[in-house]
Structure formats: structure tokens, C-alpha cells
Interface confidence: medium
Amino acid sequence: CPGACVCYNEPKVTTSCPQQGLQAVPVGIPAASQRIFLHGNRISHVPAASFRACRNLTILWLHSNVLARIDAAAFTGLALLEQLDLSDNAQLRSVDPATFHGLGRLHTLHLDRCGLQELGPGLFRGLAALQYLYLQDNALQALPDDTFRDLGNLTHLFLHGNRISSVPERAFRGLHSLDRLLLHQNRVAHVHPHAFRDLGRLMTLYLFANNLSALPTEALAPLRALQYLRLNDNPWVCDCRARPLWAWLQKFRGSSSEVPCSLPQRLAGRDLKRLAANDLQGCAVATGPYHPIWTGRATDEEPLGLPKCCQPDAADKASVLEPGRPASAGNALKGRVPPGDSPPGNGSGPRHINDSPFGTLPGSAEPPLTAVRPEGSEPPGFPTSGPRRRPGCSRKNRTRSHCRLGQAGSGGGGTGDSEGS
């Protein structure tokens, strides 16, 4: 056993060396180690094959060091590794795309607070067993296409506290099991209408504290299981272009935050959800540095980047747009998806309402958190709700013009790569 470490065999073969002032990965770690705890030291570099002898390793904690470099082959041979915690290494900044290759059993990967500025191509390739991916509190500015494509079992993705300015079409492709997506406290100004296409099992979506002034309801349509949605602290523009989102929120059977309007001035601070349909009139004039919501054909956009507003005919320029009645959104399913429809990432079987950690269910629209976390798992997700259908575009009956609201065929199909401020 290395000098600064404590080694023991029960309940698992463990080499524990936390907060010992180590400046390098110690030599002489027992080859039989199943768990290695090296957190809280001064380790700056993980050389190639540092743990190659530890074929039975399942848990490796290297968090809270001063890692600046991890060799691409640092974790070679760790085919049984299940948990890897590299968090709180702010000098790391980048990770070689090959670093995690071969970790086919990895189910939890902590890369939060690592100063990461980008996710290299193929960084998460082959991590088919991954269930929890912590990427929060980094300096990520973009979500490259297909970054998470191989993560078909991922249930929790934490991306909050970064500098992400847009959510492109292919950012979340392949995440068919995703239960929780935390994107709050970023700079997101644009969500592509198809960005969430694969997220049919998503139950929790946090987009609060971003730079959104609109959100295409087409993006929300695939979220059949969505139960918790937070959209507060964004510069929402509550004019005719917000009608589809307003209609969607009226029909949403889960729990959602307030959606406070920024524009027009007369509605500033009011909750979009609590407005009447006829409050959402005309076009708000931008007075602030609003960012593109999506990029489309130039003729379908205003300089703001918002979708083009409902415009009266040339002969009727002086008139104020009258709100049309929102088109029927179809019959949103009343019942919930059965609890087992979106199984917990830990494979412990279906979740039921009675599994609530708090034990009681205060209201039918507010299902509780689910509870039991088997050993080795991460905290739980939420029960699911029934699917909802996207509302249609509102038409101004007495003119030929109609709303451009970012739905299919309305000029809202670009990828949108605008920068946040």
C-alpha cells in the first residue's frame, strides 16, 4: 500500500489516499484494487496507463486535484470501470477525445468544474453504459453535433453553468433514455425546432437563466414525458409570436415555472402563462440586445432574429394586429404514461408514485420526486406525464398575411449558431 494511503479489503478492495498532498499518482497501488480514492490532492498529471494493473477497478476518484493534463491512454485497461470522477480540476480545460475510449462499463462520469472550453469530436464515443454525465460549471460555448450520439442509456445530463449560446438540431441526438436535462444558467438564445427530437423520455428540462426571447413549440412537441419545465429568468417577448408557446403552456399538464415577459413594456414582469390570448398582440419593438432565436430565410426574420411578426396588409398598415383564436392543439392525452415507461437509469425496475422520497402526493399535477437510489446510483428522476401535441399558428383572418412562428414550413428551420453576449 502506498505510504500516503490506507488500503483495506472490505467491503471492496480499496486504496484510499484523499487529501494527502500527493503531487503524482502514487506508485504501488495494489493491483487488486476495486476502488481508488485520490481526491483532494495536488496531482497535476495522469500519465498513460497509470492504473493499467488495476484490472478490477470499478471506482476512481480524482476530483479536487490540480489536473492540467490527462494522457489519452491514462485509463487504458480499465474495462470494468463504472465511476470516474474528474470534477473540480479547473486547470484541465481540455480532454483528449480518446481518453474515455474502452470504458464500456462506465455509468457515471464527472467532468464538472474542469474549465472545459470544448467537447472534442468523439469524446464520449462508445460509452454505451453511461447513465450520468456531469458537465456543469465549465466554459463550454457550443454543443457540437452528435456529441452524445452513443449515449443511448444516459439518463441525466448536466450542462448548467456554461456559456452555451444555442442548441443546434443534432446536439442531443441519440439520447433516447434521457430523463433530466439541465441547461440553466447558460447563454442560450436559440433552440432549434428539432433539438429535442430524440428526448421522448425526458421528464425534467431546465432552461431558466438563459437568453431566450422565444421558444419554438415544435421543439417541445417530442417531449411526451415532460413533467418539470423551468423557463424563468429569460427575456421573453410576449407578442403574437409567443402565442404558440402560450397555448402549449396552457395544455401542459406538468409543473412549469413562471415565464415572465420582458417585452412589450406593458407586459413586463407578467407571467406569460397567466396572460389572456388577446394580450399577445402585434409586434414588440426591441429595445435591448436580443439574440436570434433561430436563423431562417432573411425574409422571414426581423433584424432581431425573432421570427417575423404578423404584419397587416399594405392597405392596412396603420391597423394593429388583432389576435386570432389559437388553432386547436388536438386532444392532449389526459392520462400519464405508466410509471414504468421511463425506467430509472440504474435498472432497478419501474418507478411508482409511491416511491416518492417525500412519501406524499400533494396534487395530481405535481407528482413527487422518486426516491430509492440503489448503491452506486445517482439521485433519481421524476415520474412521467402524458404526451402533448403542439399548438398550431394563429391566423389573422382579415388579411392574407399570417404569423411566422417558427413551426414546420414557416422559415424556422435553420440551425442557428448565434453567439450569446
Epitope: Y228, F358, A371, P374, G376
Partner: antibody, heavy 124, light 107 residues
């Protein structure tokens, strides 16, 4: 500066009711689950009740279930504990505590801020 | 409910000593364990979260380790101000449960 200021404790007879309040400041109350923890004289800590950020999930220890009700008013940054059918064994110092919970952070951080405590004495 | 068993129930040690407190869960709780320090007449103070993460402002002589069912709080080089009662708390599922406490006294 972060503060959790409690009130509402005192002496009450068995079978009667009390309502505890916890008014917070210095942080975004909306983002946190909140809890009540109590400590009987000379004893250890006991979790009493918890409520999620949006009141969507609420729970109680078996010892108080059916008698105590936790609630919150996010517009007033306030947490409440309504205690009915009080018993002698409910005598304790009651603390409110902030839980920087997993729903917001991705980590469970524990109860990182506590109120000053308020003494509830149940006696005839 | 998950039972948390702390040992020892009390310990007396000298300034500069290393003190170890253990906490055992009745079932596996992954890393979801917190440690608190409480001094007489005061509210508890969070020391360690998620088994091994030091809360901001807590001296480096405190450290936590463990996973699953067995956890340890270590105070390296005990200081006079460390005289207090220490509690573990499982946060794996509700109801959250505390250990019965370990009283640390300075000889």
C-alpha cells in the same frame, strides 16, 4: 448575507396547534428545497419534513405524519410548519434548513444553511 | 427507513491527535452522505457533502471518505475548537436519517 430567521415557537398544551415560520433572505429561495429538522433536549438530530422548490414533492417523518403540514410561499421567501395534535414528545428545538438540492445543482450538497432554531415545548 | 449507526458515541483526544469517526448505513447509499458539526446551543454546520467533498470554509484538517455502506470522517491534528458533536446524515432517500452523534472532547 444569507439568513434564515425562525419564529413561532413557544409553550403549548398537548393536543393544541402551533405554526412555525422561517423567513429567508440573501439567496434565491425558489431554487432550493427546504427542510425542518428537530432536536429534543439532550438528544440527536431528527429530520421532520421537507418540501421541494415548487411544493411538488412533500414529505414527513413517520413520527409526525398526519399531524404536521409543511408549506412554502415563494413570493414571500418563507417556509412554514403547521403542527397540530401536539404531543409531549414533539418538544424540541426546531430548525429550518436549506437544501442545495440535486434538482438544481446535479449534486447533493447537504443542508448548508440553518435557521437559529426555535424551541417548542409541549406540556400540560 | 435507512438506519445510520455512528461509532464511537464519544471520543476524548488531545490537541494534535487524529480522530476518526465511522458511520455505517443499513443499506447501500452510494456517496450520498453528509457530515455535520454541532456545538452546544448552536445550529449544525455542514462539513462534508457527498461523502468526501469539503464544504466551503471548512478547515482542510477535516476529510471524509467511503462509499456504499461504510463512511469515515477524519479530523487530522485535532484543534480545541473541534470540540463538538458530529453527525452523519444519509441523503440517499427519504426520510433522511441522521446517525446518533459522536461527541468529541479535548483531553
Amino acid at each position: 448575507q444569507m439568513q434564515l430567521v425562525q419564529s413561532g415557537g413557544g409553550l403549548e398544551q398537548p393536543g393544541r396547534s402551533l405554526r412555525l415560520s422561517c423567513v429567508t433572505s440573501g439567496f434565491n429561495f425558489n431554487d432550493y428545497a427546504m427542510h425542518w429538522v428537530r432536536q429534543a433536549p439532550g438528544k440527536g438530530l431528527e429530520w421532520v419534513s421537507g418540501i421541494s422548490w415548487n411544493s411538488g414533492a412533500i414529505g414527513y417523518a413517520d413520527s409526525v405524519k398526519g399531524r404536521f403540514t409543511v408549506s412554502r410561499d415563494n413570493s414571500k421567501n418563507s417556509l412554514y410548519l403547521q403542527m397540530n395534535s401536539l404531543r409531549a414528545e414533539d418538544t424540541a428545538v426546531y430548525y429550518c434548513a436549506r437544501d442545495y438540492n440535486y434538482e438544481i445543482s446535479g449534486y447533493y450538497y447537504g443542508f448548508d444553511n440553518w435557521g437559529q432554531g426555535t424551541l417548542v415545548t409541549v406540556s400540560s | 427507513d435507512i438506519q445510520m449507526t455512528q461509532s464511537p458515541s464519544s471520543v476524548s483526544a488531545s490537541v494534535g491527535d487524529r480522530v476518526t469517526i465511522t458511520c455505517r448505513a443499513s443499506q447501500g447509499i452510494s456517496r450520498w452522505l453528509s457530515w455535520y458539526q454541532q456545538k452546544p446551543g448552536k445550529a449544525p454546520k455542514l462539513l462534508i457533502y457527498a461523502a468526501s467533498n469539503l464544504q466551503s470554509g471548512v478547515p482542510l484538517r477535516f476529510s471524509g471518505s467511503g462509499f456504499g455502506t461504510d463512511f469515515t470522517l477524519t479530523i487530522n491534528s485535532l484543534q480545541p475548537e473541534d470540540s463538538a458533536t458530529y453527525y452523519c446524515q444519509q441523503t440517499n432517500n427519504f426520510p433522511y436519517t441522521f446517525g446518533q452523534g459522536t461527541k468529541v472532547e479535548i483531553k
